[in-house]
C-alpha cells in the first residue's frame, strides 16, 4: 500500500523546533562546521543542502526532515538552492540560529515578495555595490 503523505510542517512548527534545539545551547553536533547560507528566497533548500552533510547528529534530524518537506513544497525555491557562501564555514548552531531568525521574519511578516522581485532586488543591490567599488 502507498505510504501516507506526511503533511508539510508549518513555519510555526519549524520555529518551535529551531528554538527547541538552540535554547541554552552553546554548540550543536559536536561543533560541526557547515557552509554558510545567504538569507534568500531559497533559504530552506540551501539550509538543507548545507545541513544534509552533517551525519550522526540526532539533534538536527527533525529540522532536516522539516526543511526537506518545506524545500520540496516549492519547486521554485529548490531551483535556487545553491545560494551558499562556498568560502565561509560556520558552526551548525550558527546556521540554525540564522535560519531561526529568517523563518521568524517570514512567519511574522509573510513572504511579501515574489521570487522574481527578490532576485531583481538582489541584482540591483549587487550592481550598486559593484558600481560603488568601481569608483573608490
Amino acid at each position: 500500500s502507498p505510504s501516507p503523505v506526511t503533511p508539510s510542517p508549518t513555519l510555526k512548527e519549524l520555529i518551535e523546533e529551531l528554538v527547541n534545539i538552540t535554547q541554552n545551547q552553546a554548540s550543536l553536533c559536536n561543533g560541526s562546521m557547515v557552509w554558510s547560507v545567504n538569507l534568500t528566497a531559497g533559504m530552506y533548500c540551501a539550509a538543507l543542502e548545507s545541513l544534509i552533510n552533517v551525519s550522526d547528529c540526532s539533534a538536527i534530524q527533525r529540522t532536516q526532515r522539516m526543511l526537506k518537506a518545506l524545500c520540496s513544497q516549492k519547486p521554485a525555491a529548490g531551483q535556487i538552492s545553491s545560494e551558499r557562501s562556498r568560502d565561509t564555514k560556520i558552526e551548525v548552531i550558527q546556521l540554525v540560529k540564522n535560519l531561526l531568525t529568517y523563518v521568524r521574519g517570514v512567519y511574522r511578516h509573510g513572504n511579501f515578495r515574489g521570487l522574481n522581485d527578490i532576485f531583481e532586488a538582489q541584482k540591483i543591490e549587487w550592481h550598486e555595490h559593484h558600481h560603488h567599488h568601481h569608483h573608490h
Epitope: T101, G105, H109, G110, R113, A121, Q122, E125
Partner: antibody, heavy 116, light 111 residues
Framework: ELTLQESGPGLVKPSQTLSLTCVVS?????????WDWIRQRPGRGLEWMGS?????WYNPAFQGRISITADTAKNQLSLQLSSVTTGDTAVYFC???????????WGQGTLVTVSS | QSVLTQPASVSGSLGQRVTISCSGR????????ANWYQQVPGKAPKLLVS???NRPSGVPDRFSASNSANSATLTITGLQAEDEADYYC???????????FGGGTQLTVLG
C-alpha cells in the same frame, strides 16, 4: 475597541531593573497575535525591543537583560529590563502586531527616566 | 544609525502631493517590504499603510505606499494641516534578527 495601557515607575535608578506592565482591554492577549514592546528615546526614532508570542523573542541589542512575559488570565504583558543606564531613558510603548498589517494597536506610552 | 534610511524632513504646501522615501536592502525591505506609521508629537504612532497596501479603517485614501526593489515610498496627496507629523517606515531585518524602523521623517505643511 482594543486599548493598551502601559504603567510603571516613572523613575528608575541606574543599575536597577525597569519593570513595566501593559494592560489590554477590549480584547485578549493570545498567541494569535504578537505583543511587542517598542521604545523611543528623547528626540530619537522607534526601537523594537522584543515580542511575546508562542516563542518570545528579543532584539539582540537587548539580549541578556530583557524579559517579556504575559499573564493571559489578567490580560496583561510585562517588560523587565535589567542593569539600566541613563541611555534607557525613553517612552516605552506596547503594541499589537498583526501579520500582514503591522502594529495596528498601540498604547499611549509611558515615560521612564533613569537617573540617580 | 538606522538600517532603513529616511530623509530627516520634507515639506509641502496645503493640497500638494509629497513623497517620503525609505531606503533599505534585500535582507529587509527587499524581502519584507515596509509598513508606514504616523506619529504626532507626544502621541503613540498610528499605522497608515502596511507593506501589502492595506490601510486601516479611518486612514484616508490620500495615503498610499509602494515598494520597489529595496526601497519603499509613502505618498500623501492633497496635503492637509493635520498631516504635519513624523512618519516612520518599518520592516524586518534578517541580518540583525530584529524588527527595524527608519529614523523618521518630519513633515511640515506650509500654509
Amino acid at each position: 475597541e482594543l486599548t493598551l495601557q502601559e504603567s510603571g515607575p516613572g523613575l528608575v535608578k541606574p543599575s536597577q531593573t525597569l519593570s513595566l506592565t501593559c494592560v489590554v482591554s477590549g480584547g485578549s492577549v493570545t498567541n494569535t497575535y504578537e505583543w511587542d514592546w517598542i521604545r523611543q528615546r528623547p528626540g530619537r526614532g522607534l526601537e523594537w525591543m522584543g515580542s511575546w508570542t508562542d516563542n518570545t523573542w528579543y532584539n539582540p541589542a537587548f539580549q541578556g537583560r530583557i524579559s517579556i512575559t504575559a499573564d493571559t488570565a489578567k490580560n496583561q504583558l510585562s517588560l523587565q529590563l535589567s542593569s539600566v543606564t541613563t541611555g534607557d531613558t525613553a517612552v516605552y510603548f506596547c503594541a499589537r502586531w498583526t501579520k500582514r498589517w503591522g502594529y495596528d494597536y498601540w498604547g499611549q506610552g509611558t515615560l521612564v527616566t533613569v537617573s540617580s | 544609525q538606522s538600517v532603513l534610511t529616511q530623509p530627516a524632513s520634507v515639506s509641502g504646501s496645503l493640497g500638494q502631493r509629497v513623497t517620503i522615501s525609505c531606503s533599505g536592502r534585500t535582507n529587509n525591505i527587499g524581502y519584507f517590504g515596509a509598513n508606514w506609521y504616523q506619529q504626532v508629537p507626544g502621541k503613540a504612532p498610528k499605522l497608515l499603510v502596511s507593506s501589502y497596501g492595506n490601510r486601516p479603517s479611518g486612514v484616508p485614501d490620500r495615503f498610499s505606499a509602494s515598494n520597489s526593489a529595496n526601497s519603499a515610498t509613502l505618498t500623501i496627496t492633497g496635503l492637509q494641516a493635520e498631516d504635519e507629523a513624523d512618519y516612520y517606515c518599518q520592516s524586518f531585518d534578517t541580518t540583525l534578527g530584529a524588527v527595524v524602523f527608519g529614523g523618521g521623517t518630519q513633515l511640515t505643511v506650509l500654509g
